[in-house]
């Protein structure tokens, strides 16, 4: 039976059919971050749980040292949510000399690192000013989109301030990717 | 022609090929919630429209009694947005004795229920402090991620306060899942 | 070899198998918007980058004149993030006569246009009151969900105020869709 008998008329003959169940996939969940040095003007990367609870990696998608390693070229949907929480925000203080303070902010970046390319690529960024009146505040930033990745690419999640990340529950802060 | 001639070299032979069009999928949209009693310390579950307007269920993914029923084991992408709106928030009142009030909050949880397991599992949570200065406020919480589910699992969306959910438009508050 | 030997027992025989790599897909990124006339009570549509940087269209998914053109009927996952930024918000001013002002707001709508249907359909809406105490504020609205689309449907992203859209970085404001 010819393969193209299954295929819509526009399918390229050479495109391989593929079982969905064997595609690279990962869902990583938050863990408490270990104190690490990071450069002043560089957002620190989060590290993740990859096998306990809701977390998993499968079909050659591996997690190592804060990175998800892309095992196969293709189009991937990549997503992350980071829940931040804090205990006041400077700009809620009384304005000095009638001039509002620069607002605090929280930022999440999903970054791609390609060994053959010197600079990391920012794939997705969610950034929000935080100017809360109440004493303690909390809020999530969610990101998700599709990107063409190459075998060997590495993905990480960077945040503006690691100390504000809510690491208490695996459903609040997470990171995942799957081959489409 | 042998099936594996279509397959990339890393494909497990036993993985079945599968037509995408017959995978379980659902997109549910908000309806006005009917007045029901719910326990004080338990977040109430939303019920949904499953066939009118933009809403649909297909390929054995069924909606019944606030639950999406998973018909087949596999990896699913699950998502929801809930738009909340309210007409004040207590912490916007003048601070008593110079001390800010504990903020109000809004929370969405996507929950999995497995009959063989006594406790529901929280898959995703979006939670946000609400401390609005203006009189009426509104904002969405969006969630989405991939999970390995088993046939017979049930999914629901719980919220911290059903009365704050914006039920007026199907594009503002919704819930969906699809087999990858 | 018979096709159904690949298929789970519940697969409809007539459903064509399909190589994932040839499915219509697009990820569009923000560009600076050119000033255009738009009607007072109609949210303006954003236009997008479709080939430079992270942006791409493939497999007959075309971008033209603010629209993504759907080349094939099926279920699509559609997503967008718009990052807004501004320089104060009226409702942070002192309340007049004890009555809070109506809050400002930011809104994103993903809209479907079907030539045979007179009215556009709003698929997704993210709307948020903005009542910031600080001077300059910024925040994203993210949307994503699955919809059944028909060949020839057109998708666009509309916003409440084009002048508040952050067009500075391709990772902050984007729009995409892919056939499932």
């Amino acid at each position: 039976l010819k393969g193209q008998e299954f295929a819509p008329s526009h399918q390229q003959v050479y495109a391989p059919l593929r079982a969905d169940g064997d595609k690279p996939r990962a869902h990583l969940t938050v863990v408490r971050q270990t104190p690490t040095q990071h450069f002043k003007n560089q957002f620190p990367a989060l590290h993740w749980e990859h096998e306990l609870g809701l977390a998993f990696t499968k079909n050659r998608m591996n997690y190592t040292n804060k990175f998800l390693l892309i095992p196969e070229s293709g189009d991937y949907f990549i997503y992350s949510q980071v829940t931040f929480r804090g205990m006041t925000s400077e700009c809620s203080e009384i304005r000095q000399a009638g001039r509002p303070n620069k607002p605090d902010s929280i930022t999440v970046v999903i970054t791609k690192v390609t060994d053959s390319y010197p600079e990391p690529t920012q794939l997705l960024m969610g950034t929000k000013s935080v100017c809360e009146v109440g004493s303690n505040w909390f809020q999530p930033i969610y990101l998700g989109a599709m990107f063409s990745l190459q075998e060997g690419d590495k993905l990480m999640v960077n945040v503006s301030d690691i100390s504000l990340v809510d690491y208490t529950k695996e459903d609040k802060t997470f990171f995942g990717a799957f081959l489409l | 022609l042998k099936g594996q001639e279509f397959a990339p070299s890393h494909q497990q032979v036993y993985a079945p090929l599968r037509a995408d069009g017959d995978k379980p999928r659902a997109h549910l949209t908000v309806v006005r919630q009917t007045p029901t009693q719910h326990f004080k310390n338990q977040f109430p579950a939303l019920h949904w429209e499953h066939e009118l307007g933009l809403a649909f269920t297909k390929n054995r993914m069924n909606y019944t009694n606030k639950f999406l029923l998973i018909p087949e084991s596999g990896d699913y992408f699950i998502y929801s947005q809930v738009t909340f709106r309210g007409m004040t928030s207590e912490c916007s009142e003048i601070r008593q004795a110079g001390r800010p009030n504990k903020p109000d909050s809004i929370t969405v949880v996507i929950t999995k229920v497995t009959d063989s397991y006594p406790e529901p599992t929280q898959l995703l949570m979006g939670t946000k402090s609400v401390c609005e200065v203006g009189s009426n406020w509104f904002q969405p919480i969006y969630l989405g991620a991939m999970f390995s589910l088993q046939e017979g699992d049930k999914l629901m969306v719980n919220v911290s306060d059903i009365s704050l959910v914006d039920y007026t438009k199907e594009d503002k508050t919704f819930f969906g899942a699809f087999l990858l | 070899l018979k096709g159904q030997e690949f298929a789970p027992s519940h697969q409809q025989v007539y459903a064509p198998l399909r190589a994932d790599g040839d499915k219509p897909r697009a990820h569009l990124t923000v560009v600076r918007q050119t000033p255009t006339q738009h009607f007072k009570n109609q949210f303006p549509a954003l236009h997008w980058e479709h080939e430079l940087g992270l942006a791409f269209t493939k497999n007959r998914m075309n971008y033209t004149n603010k629209f993504l053109l759907i080349p094939e009927s099926g279920d699509y996952f559609i997503y967008s993030q718009v990052t807004f930024r501004g320089m104060t918000s009226e409702c942070s001013e002192i309340r007049q006569a004890g009555r809070p002002n109506k809050p400002d707001s930011i809104t994103v709508v993903i809209t479907k246009v079907t030539d045979s249907y007179p009215e556009p359909t709003q698929l997704l809406m993210g709307t948020k009151s903005v009542c910031e105490v600080g001077s300059n504020w910024f925040q994203p609205i993210y949307l994503g969900a699955m919809f059944s689309l028909q060949e020839g449907d057109k998708l666009m992203v509309n916003v409440s105020d084009i002048s508040l859209v952050d067009y500075t970085k391709e990772d902050k404001t984007f729009f995409g869709a892919f056939l499932l």
Epitope: - | V31, T34, G86, M87, T88, E90, S163, L164 | P100
Partner: antibody, heavy 119, light 111 residues
Framework: QVQLVQSGAEVKKPGASVKVSCKAS????????INWVRQAPGQGLEWMGW????????GYAQKFQGRVTMTADRSTSTAYMELSSLRSEDTAVYYC????????????WGQGTLVTVSS | QSVLTQPPSVSGAPGQRVTISCTSS?????????VHWYQQLPGTAPKLLIE???NRPSGVPDRFSGSKSGTSASLTITGLLPEDEGDYYC??????????FGGGTKLTVLG
């Protein structure tokens, strides 16, 4: 202009049912929820429930659950409220009211229908 | 179950100002959809007067205003007129979005 016109007064015996109609005009009937509110003689207003004319979905006050049924006929832009197992304390003026979607305030009211329950 | 409490009656002379309060038994009155006020003149159906604490529908004179503080909302009528005499109801919602009405306040215009 928006109008809600209700059916005429009814006299019913205890244990019977009554069905009150509310014909809408001047707007798209399926775009706004209809509520029913009653007022016993000399008493205050009491909410009974809401009806979405588009989907047919309803929400009833706990007090009336099991006894009230709200329906809509989209072809005639008419909402109905049926109350069963009537008792003397159901004697009241019954109002239909159209809601403002954003705030659920009752913006337009019918003129009211007096239902008297007497043996 | 939340309860909205209004004074049974208030009165004032023409030209005066009167305020009708509406107090909730729960922590924050109308947190979801606000508090609405209705006027019911003798022998007529209720009429929406104030929507969402503060907002007057078109056609409602600016003599009518609404406010909110903590667990109570208020309707204030300035420059009282004889034709304002009637019953006034506040309305809000409980946690399941069931509508609640206050018991009503009878306004008498003296003289």
């Amino acid at each position: 202009q928006v109008q809600l016109v209700q059916s005429g007064a009814e006299v019913k015996k205890p244990g019977a049912s009554v069905k009150v109609s509310c014909k809408a005009s001047g707007y798209t009937f399926t775009s706004y929820d209809i509520n029913w509110v009653r007022q016993a003689p000399g008493q205050g207003l009491e909410w009974m429930g809401w009806l979405n004319p588009n989907s047919g979905n309803t929400g009833y006050a706990q007090k009336f659950q099991g006894r009230v049924t709200m329906t809509a006929d989209r072809s005639t832009s008419t909402a109905y409220m049926e109350l069963s197992s009537l008792r003397s304390e159901d004697t009241a003026v019954y109002y239909c009211a159209r809601e403002v979607p954003e705030t659920a305030a009752f913006e337009y009211w019918g003129q009211g229908t007096l239902v008297t329950v007497s043996s | 179950q939340s309860v909205l409490t209004q004074p049974p009656s208030v009165s004032g002379a023409p030209g005066q100002r009167v305020t009708i309060s509406c107090t909730s038994s729960s922590s924050d009155i109308g947190a979801a959809l606000g508090v609405h006020w209705y006027q019911q003149l003798p022998g007529t159906a209720p009429k929406l007067l104030i929507e969402g604490y503060y907002n007057r529908p078109s056609g409602v004179p600016d003599r009518f205003s609404g406010s909110k503080s903590g667990t109570s909302a208020s309707l204030t009528i300035t420059g009282l007129l004889p034709e304002d005499e009637g019953d006034y109801y506040c309305q809000s919602f409980d946690g399941t979005l069931s509508a609640l009405f206050g018991g009503g306040t009878k306004l008498t215009v003296l003289g």
